[in-house]
Amino acid sequence: AADPLLGGQGPAKDCEKDQFQCRNERCIPSVWRCDEDDDCLDHSDEDDCPKKTCADSDFTCDNGHCIHERWKCDGEEECPDGSDESEATCTKQVCPAEKLSCGPTSHKCVPASWRCDGEKDCEGGADEAGCATLCAPHEFQCGNRSCLAAVFVCDGDDDCGDGSDERGCADPACGPREFRCGGDGGGACIPERWVCDRQFDCEDRSDEAAELCGRPGPGATSAPAACATASQFACRSGECVHLGWRCDGDRDCKDKSDEADCPLGTCRGDEFQCGDGTCVLAIKHCNQEQDCPDGSDEAGCLQGLNECLHNNGGCSHICTDLKIGFECTCPAGFQLLDQKTCGDIDECKDPDACSQICVNYKGYFKCECYPGYEMDLLTKNCKAAAGKSPSLIFTNRHEVRRIDLVKRNYSRLIPMLKNVVALDVEVATNRIYWCDLSYRKIYSAYMDKASDPKEQEVLIDEQLHSPEGLAVDWVHKHIYWTDSGNKTISVATVDGGRRRTLFSRNLSEPRAIAVDPLRGFMYWSDWGDQAKIEKSGLNGVDRQTLVSDNIEWPNGITLDLLSQRLYWVDSKLHQLSSIDFSGGNRKTLISSTDFLSHPFGIAVFEDKVFWTDLENEAIFSANRLNGLEISILAENLNNPHDIVIFHELKQPRAPDACELSVQPNGGCEYLCLPAPQISSHSPKYTCACPDTMWLGPDMKRCYRAPQSTSTTTLASTMTRTVPATTRAPGTTVHRSTYQNHSTETPSLTAAVPSSVSVPRAPSISPSTLSPATSNHSQHYANEDSKMGSTVTAA
């Protein structure tokens, strides 16, 4: 979109070295060249730009520029050649649900959030039709429906951007020693002495008109013999500039002659350097006495001298006359690049500028929402647009309960449990998964039948010690869990039939786990001595630490897949923090011993973050961008632990690479695990075997013993060569062959070949604290004494 704030300056013959000369002789900052905005207003700054290869998610303009696909046919020309809004591109377009049609005669669609926002985004203004007046009583409503402080009306500046604040204004009378630019046309007033001084001070150049000055207009004339006033310096290139600008380090003359032949700056800090290089005391500057031989200490100090009237002081946008000198400033949305030139502020660099999508324009920005969400006009946050209202499901060790986040009704989903901490859901199938620490099992059930014990399926019931974290990969149909007793992280199919240990090394107290099936990663927290948050591919490769400093007891973690941030609570530091998926841009959102006394579980949805607190026995919520608006969702909850949001938008559909392959299950004999999508060349999946078996040379079939030909693993962390034997006759692997128990024999898999080892005997100190006490520890003693051992619990 063109910059509405530029303009109003006459063409110039030569531009400064850091400027670009437009075909129409306008000068613009060089940084605006090839930025896909028509700043010259004749497109010349966007001509001959290097052509780009646009991304798949972009629209390619006819002239080769790239813009976001969602900007196509949105009623605003983002392509310099307008091809994104052409009839050919947009004809017969049906507006998607989250967009607004610009009317029956238009082919354009604009984001629904742009309705009644004060800007006519549709060419006919359909998006602003029938909107209520929004401006406050002390404000002026512009023609484009934006609001403006009344003081800006009729001040000579187009503050509205459509000129409506300067229409119908009475012409201000010029003073007795002033000249009105443009004759009687209502132009600006300038000092009379600036008329015929061979410098254009009026926008229309009327102060130097030939008929007025009795000579040809200024152009290729030689330098004037002298300038109109003694307080000006005659540039060799013909213009006059303020004498105080001579040797001030700024090149004000077109030929830079005001900075030529300057003596080296030798004046002390308490001195003022005169134009001729001599020094006088700084207090003598502008004391209405000429102290410099050349009078430069009083140049520009004369009462009533307004430098802004001369070429706008050299400012690209707003010039403010000061008692001494002047100051260049910028309108909202712009910042000074070099004390004089305004450049756009990219508000979208602030990750919190919008709750979801931020689109930067010259001088302003707009927020948009992802598909499935719509803008809440009151809060400007993105809310779920359709479907059922979101629910919050949480465990309190003996039950799984549900709170509707909108309707706020409360129900018991699963009563009479023994010691449940971890849970997750699969929204598309309406299933819930949970771990019971006392029974040492992982269960699943349909949510509407989960209260019936007969409907509760046992998925995993062997080789489990303390499953404290659970996550469902809803795309590839797997469950992942942490076990703080075995000190492992494992994966299984959602029916529990096929299982694999992914990590058993360098884990101390693994707790929460979260998955990102769209990108193929999993994340987990470990609150051991070297507390950390780690990440790896869903197949166990590319393990890396994201957070290892300023972290003590990271309990819950959760992912915001839209903003690609990980949130966690630390119950020792009493903090709620977030990082991006690479571990960067860390933020502490909330630090509070009151609201985060002993936080455990955490979840994110829309503009809010939710967490459970064991000490407060409550569920809290806050704004996920800034940590403000903390409120109690529910209290008196008795040990609320893990917490998840149940809503279709939390688990977006995505292709299952294992099922899309030519062979079923990706050709894998046992487990097909998604690989992390690090680049476009990343494999989509790798195969894995049970803990007791080895992956063969084809990287797909499983063998009871290693093969004779050596095979190299795919693991990025370690490479290992293993002697192998042939497959024993009669040992073709069928599903029924596999046992769910694991002897933890290392097997060669594409996942983590060297990560699996014989589990150590858990050295967990039983807690002497009752879970009901307020001084919550991180370990709990197993309540079921019949089990005969202590369990690492919440």
Epitope: D376, K383, A384, A386, G387, K388, S389, D404, L405, V406, K407, R408, N409, Y410, S411, S631, I632, A634, E635, N636, L637
Partner: antibody, heavy 122, light 106 residues
Framework: QVTLKESGPGILQPSQTLSLTCTFS??????????VGWVRQPSGKGLEWLAN???????FYNPSLKNRLTVSKDTSNNQAFLRITNGDTADTATYFC??????????????WGQGTSVTVSS | DTVLTQSPALAVSPGERVSISCRAS??????MHWYQQNPGQQSKLLIY???NLASGVPARFGGSGSGTDFTLTIDPVEADDTATYFC?????????FGGGTKLELK
């Protein structure tokens, strides 16, 4: 300004179906977080929550009357409806409809109709 | 169902402080609301979620409590506060009302 108004048959005979309409203005049942609830009050007695319907067409019925109640809505005409089958003299009461606000208001009834009196009598 | 118990009637002089109690048979969290009902008039929401003042309600009205015991307070009582006051919980299904407390002025 939010207003709600109930209308109904006034009098009906036992075993007949009682049909009530709530016509409202000042809000829409298309708006996220909005609901309309039905409450009744026999003369000189307390209030009883009967049913409610939400913007997403989610419905709730009081279990004690569940198989006799049907709630529905017509969002384009700003109306909500309640049907009670197999009317009984115990259904004689003043029937109210009210707006329910979800989220932080927590399911409270923040605007009420004036009520419509229904008598079930042979 | 969650039973809400209120004392049937209270008499108080204008200018005094009055507290109307509501006890729940099981925990209702903070999801307790209070209404004012006058014959021939529309019922009015006074307090939502235990202690939040509804729009347009005078600051003389206040609410407190947690778990199972909740209180509506009017301080000072004015002549037009004569009405029946109902508590209602929305935490447990089905939502239920208290029997109402009739406030009379001496």
């Amino acid at each position: 300004q939010v207003t709600l108004k109930e209308s109904g048959p006034g009098i009906l005979q036992p075993s007949q179906t009682l049909s009530l309409t709530c016509t409202f203005s000042g809000f829409s049942l298309n708006t996220y977080g909005m609901g309309v609830g039905w409450v009744r009050q026999p003369s000189g007695k307390g209030l009883e929550w009967l049913a409610n319907i939400w913007w997403d067409d989610d419905k709730f019925y009081n279990p004690s009357l569940k198989n006799r109640l049907t709630v529905s809505k017509d969002t384009s005409n700003n109306q909500a409806f309640l049907r009670i089958t197999n009317g009984d003299t115990a259904d004689t009461a003043t029937y109210f409809c009210a707006r329910i606000l979800g989220e932080d208001i927590g399911g409270a009834l923040d605007a009420w109709g004036q009520g419509t009196s229904v008598t079930v009598s042979s | 169902d969650t039973v809400l118990t209120q004392s049937p009637a209270l008499a108080v002089s204008p200018g005094e402080r009055v507290s109307i109690s509501c006890r729940a048979s099981e925990g209702v969290n903070s999801y307790m609301h209070w209404y004012q009902q006058n014959p021939g008039q529309q019922s009015k929401l006074l307090i939502y979620r235990t202690s939040n003042l509804a729009s347009g309600v005078p600051a003389r009205f206040g609410g407190s409590g947690s778990g199972t015991d909740f209180t509506l307070t009017i301080d000072p009582v004015e002549a037009d506060d004569t009405a029946t006051y109902f508590c209602q919980q929305s935490w447990n299904d089905p939502p239920t009302f208290g029997g109402g407390t009739k406030l009379e002025l001496k």
